[in-house]
Amino acid sequence: SERCDDWGLDTMRQIQVFEDEPARIKCPLFEHFLKFNYSTAHSAGLTLIWYWTRQDRDLEEPINFRLPENRISKEKDVLWFRPTLLNDTGNYTCMLRNTTYCSKVAFPLEVVQKDSCFNSPMKLPVHKLYIEYGIQRITCPNVDGYFPSSVKPTITWYMGCYKIQNFNNVIPEGMNLSFLIALISNNGNYTCVVTYPENGRTFHLTRTLTVKVVGSPKNAVPPVIHSPNDHVVYEKEPGEELLIPCTVYFSFLMDSRNEVWWTIDGKKPDDITIDVTINESISHSRTEDETRTQILSIKKVTSEDLKRSYVCHARSAKGEVAKAAKVKQKVPAPRYTVELACGFGAT
C-alpha cells in the first residue's frame, strides 16, 4: 500500500467509556493533527476509514458496522457505540484518504466496568468549589451530542452510592448540581446518570467527577512567612552547621504558582560559591492552602558566612514578600584561666 502519514498511537487520548453505555468518539485527526475539519476533508473527496486492533492482539481488522441494531456505526467523524461491550477495548485507528493523500492516527479505547456505587478504574475529573462562597454549580460533563435538544432526558445525581435527595446544602437541578454553601463535608465523588430514549430503546450515560472544596478567594491573603522571624536568632560558631527554615503559608488560589526561594547577599544560592543545600517540603490543608518549607543548610559555616544576609522570599498571585533571618556569630564564652585572670591583673 502507498505511503500514509502515520501519527502513531495517541496515548494522550486514553479514552475510557463505561460498559453497556453509548459512546461517541471523534476521530482525533481533526482535533489535534490536521489543520482542516471533517467537512472540508469530505467535500475534497477524502474518505474516513475506521479499523481496530483488539486488546492483546496485533492484527488490525475492520470494524463490523453490520451488527444487530447498528451497535457500532459511523456518523461523519464520529464512531458510535450503542452501547459498548467489554470486549470493544482495543486500539482504534481512523484513516483519512483518497488516491493521493493518506493520514491516520490510532488511539486506545478502554471499556470499563462500574459497580453499583459507580466505583471503577475511570480517571475522574476534579471540580474545585470555593468554601462558603455562595451558590456554586457543577454540570454533568460530556453529554453533548448524545441526544437531540428535542429529547428531554431524566438526570439523577448521586454522592457515592446514594441518590442526592433532601441533602442539607446540595440540590439537583437537571444537568446541574447546586451547592448552596460548599463545605468540607461536600468533598467526594458525584455521579450524574442521564437516561434518554432512542429508537424505542433506553440508554444511560454515567459521568462521575470528584468535588474538592478549596479555600475561597474572599479569604486569600499574600504569602505569610512564619519563619524566619524576629524572635529567632541563628547564633553559630564557625565550623558548626547552619540550618535556617523558611516556612511560608499560601492561601489557595486557583491556578496560582507558589514560589519560595532564598537569597544570600542578594544572590540565588546557585550563583555563589559557598557550599549550601536547600531542601523543600510541601504540605496542604484540607482546603488546599499550602505550607512550603525550604531549609537552607551550610554544613560547616565560616565566620564570613555568618556575616552574610540570608533572605527568604515568597511569591503568589496575591503578592511577594521577603524576610531576613537574624544570623550572628556566637561570642565564645570566656575561658576563666586566661581571660578572667588577665582581667584581674594577673601576670
Epitope: 466496568q113 459497580d115 453499583s116 456505587c117 466505583n119 454522592m159 457515592g160 452510592c161 446514594y162 441518590k163 442526592i164 435527595q165 433532601n166 441533602f167 442539607n168 446540595v170 463535608s185 467526594g188 465523588n189
Partner: antibody, heavy 119, light 107 residues
C-alpha cells in the same frame, strides 16, 4: 476500633412507637452511612433504611415508608431509628450497621436491640 | 425489588468437609453481592463482598464466585466455628435485599 453500641431491649404496646439508638465510637461517624436492618424471630434479614449523617439525608424501604424515621445527631455520633404504629409482626431484633459512602456492604454491626410488641 | 433465593435452606455437613451454598437473584446484580455469617444471638458478620473478595480477617477457606444471577459461597473445609446461618445480599439496586439464609449444621 470502631464500634456501634445500641440501646437496650424494649417492650411496646401495639399502636405505640419505639426509638432505638445506635452510638458510634472510634471516630468517622459523619463519613459513613448508618443502615438499619431487622430480623424477626427465626426469620431472615430485612433492610429498612439508612441515613447519611453529614448530609442529613435519609432513605427508606418502600415497605416502611411513612412509618419509620431515621435521624442522626453528629454531636453525639448517634443514629436513631423510630418505628411508629407498632404491630405484633414488628417484633424483631433491630440492627444498625455502618456502610461507607462508596462501598455498599455492611462491615460493622451493632449488637442488636430486641423490640417486643405485645398487648 | 430484586428477590434473592438461597438454597438449600439447610445444609448438613461433617467437619472437614466442603460446603457449597447457592444464591440466585431474580435479575442480574452484576458482581454487587455480599455474603454474611450469623451465629445464634450475634449480629451478622461480613464475609465476602463484590461476589468474590474476602473481607478483612476472613479465613481463606471462605470463597465466593459468580456474577449476574448465580452466586456460590464455598467453605473448603468446615471448622466447628463455621456452623451458622449464611445470608447473601444484593446491593445492585435499591432497596438492598437479602436471601432468606442457609443454615449450615453439623451432620
Amino acid at each position: 476500633q470502631v464500634q456501634l453500641v445500641q440501646s437496650g431491649a424494649e417492650v411496646k404496646k401495639p399502636g405505640s412507637s419505639v426509638k432505638v439508638s445506635c452510638k458510634a465510637s472510634g471516630g468517622g461517624f459523619s463519613e459513613y452511612a448508618i443502615h438499619w436492618v431487622r430480623q424477626a424471630p427465626g426469620q431472615g434479614l430485612e433492610w429498612m433504611g439508612a441515613i447519611l449523617p453529614e448530609q442529613g439525608a435519609a432513605y427508606y424501604a418502600q415497605k416502611f415508608q411513612g412509618r419509620v424515621t431515621i435521624t442522626a445527631d453528629e454531636s453525639t455520633s448517634t443514629a436513631y431509628m423510630e418505628l411508629s404504629s407498632l404491630r405484633s409482626e414488628d417484633t424483631a431484633v433491630y440492627y444498625c450497621a455502618r456502610v461507607g459512602l462508596y462501598v455498599p456492604y455492611m462491615d460493622i454491626w451493632g449488637q442488636g436491640t430486641l423490640v417486643t410488641v405485645s398487648s | 425489588e430484586i428477590v434473592m433465593t438461597q438454597s438449600p435452606a439447610t445444609l448438613s455437613v461433617s467437619p472437614g468437609e466442603r460446603a457449597t451454598l447457592s444464591c440466585r437473584a431474580s435479575q442480574s446484580v452484576s458482581s454487587n453481592l455480599a455474603w454474611y455469617q450469623q451465629k445464634p444471638g450475634q449480629a451478622p458478620r461480613l464475609l465476602i463482598y463484590g461476589a468474590s473478595t474476602r473481607a478483612t480477617g476472613i479465613p481463606a477457606r471462605f470463597s465466593g464466585s459468580g456474577s449476574g444471577t448465580e452466586f456460590t459461597l464455598t467453605i473448603s473445609s468446615l471448622q466447628s466455628e463455621d456452623f451458622a446461618v449464611y445470608y447473601c445480599q444484593q446491593y445492585n439496586n435499591w432497596p438492598w435485599t437479602f436471601g432468606q439464609g442457609t443454615k449450615v449444621e453439623i451432620k
